[in-house]
Interface confidence: medium
């Protein structure tokens, strides 16, 4: 059956300077390929975090994704700023051999509202 990506929260509100968790789980680790978080959609979407080892300032994974059969790809964003507002999508990709990775499933999106402190 097709992998399913779930973001249970429709929205989260966070005060500027605080941290927030964006929840995402998948039903399967197959097909092989990374999970990435984006803000926005289409041409303007911005890569926020990738579970592929790179360093992303202010963002880290919540659970240990190196553990076998871990299905939780939630992230924590710390020291949130007004520029962090927007809709975040957790996206599953299928790894390409020579061609680029292919997006196969996206979560429904979680809108982040940033409140003035």
């Amino acid at each position: 059956t097709e992998v399913k990506v779930t973001q249970p929260e429709k929205s989260v509100s966070v005060a500027a300077g605080d941290s927030t968790i964006l929840n995402c789980t998948v039903t399967s680790l197959l097909p092989v390929g990374p999970i990435r978080w984006y803000r926005g959609v289409g041409q303007s979407r911005l890569l926020i975090y990738s579970f592929t080892g790179e360093h992303f300032p202010r963002i880290r994974n919540v659970s240990d994704t190196t553990k076998r059969n871990n299905m939780d790809f939630s992230i924590r964003i710390s020291n949130v700023t007004p520029e962090d507002a927007g809709t975040y999508y957790c996206v599953k990709f299928q790894r390409g051999s020579s061609e680029p990775d292919t997006e196969i499933q996206s979560g429904g999106g979680t809108e982040v509202y940033v409140l003035a402190k």
Epitope: K4, T6, P8, E9, K10, S11, T25, G108
Partner: antibody, heavy 119, light 108 residues
Framework: EVQLVESGGGVVQPGRSLRLSCAAS????????VNWVRQAPGKGLEWVSL????????YYADSVKGRFTISRDNSKNTLYLQMNSLRAEDTAVYYC????????????WGQGTLVTVSS | EIVLTQSPGTLSLSPGERATLSCRAS??????LAWYQQKPGQAPRLLIY???SRATGIPDRFSGSGSGTEFTLTISSLQSEDFAVYYC??????????FGGGTKVEIK
């Protein structure tokens, strides 16, 4: 105080159509996703359809897909359910239900309107 | 689609007794579970969300617990107004949103 008032129910023959309305007040209607949930006589609750605050996102239960259409008019604070090709098994009390702003559970419900499909 | 199974179907108890209602999910819904109360001729009313958080205005004799696939609604001491049908609902999965079949709490 949040109020949801359904109307438009009644007795209708199989194959015919009916349009339900839900008038909302006491909250910023356009900011909330709203749903239709039904309950057949003596039975449990069955989710029917969902529409997002902007109207851009819509979901249906498989049992009504292709026959029912959910819509909303944010300028009138009103939710609609257009029901076509009605069947006996669509007989139920239809409730409109306002979702929580963060999660998909229902913190406010209307009183319901009864739809009876019978020849 | 996530299936919710409630048990028992009917619970016959006396006022003052403790009621324990169960809801089992076909797959993990973490703590994304709500409980509703419905009295005859009335709309459902939200009691519990997040598996254990009481909704506004709900008396503290109502409590929810559980996570994953097993959930419990407990009414510590039944009052006359608590005799009703109770439904669980998961909101972890993207629609279709699903309800359990209900548990009727009746006077013994």
């Amino acid at each position: 105080e949040v109020q949801l008032v359904e109307s438009g129910g009644g007795v209708v023959q199989p194959g015919r159509s009916l349009r339900l309305s839900c008038a909302a007040s006491g909250f910023t209607f356009s900011s909330y996703d709203v749903n239709w949930v039904r309950q057949a006589p003596g039975k449990g609750l069955e989710w029917v359809s969902l529409i997002s605050g902007s109207g851009e996102i819509i979901y249906y239960a498989d049992s009504v897909k292709g026959r029912f259409t959910i819509s909303r008019d944010n300028s009138k604070n009103t939710l609609y359910l257009q029901m076509n090709s009605l069947r006996a098994e669509d007989t139920a009390v239809y409730y409109c239900a306002k979702e929580n702003n963060r999660y998909r559970f229902f913190d406010d419900w209307g009183q319901g309107t009864l739809v009876t499909v019978s020849s | 689609e996530i299936v919710l199974t409630q048990s028992p179907g009917t619970l016959s108890l006396s006022p003052g007794e403790r009621a324990t209602l169960s809801c089992r999910a076909s797959q993990s819904v973490y703590t994304y579970l709500a409980w509703y109360q419905q009295k005859p001729g009335q709309a459902p009313r939200l009691l519990i969300y997040g598996a254990s958080s009481r909704a506004t205005g709900i008396p503290d004799r109502f409590s929810g617990s559980g996570s994953g696939t097993e959930f419990t609604l407990t009414i510590s001491s039944l009052q006359s107004e608590d005799f009703a049908v109770y439904y669980c609902q998961q909101y972890y999965d993207r629609p279709p949103l699903t309800f359990g079949g209900g548990t009727k709490v009746e006077i013994k």
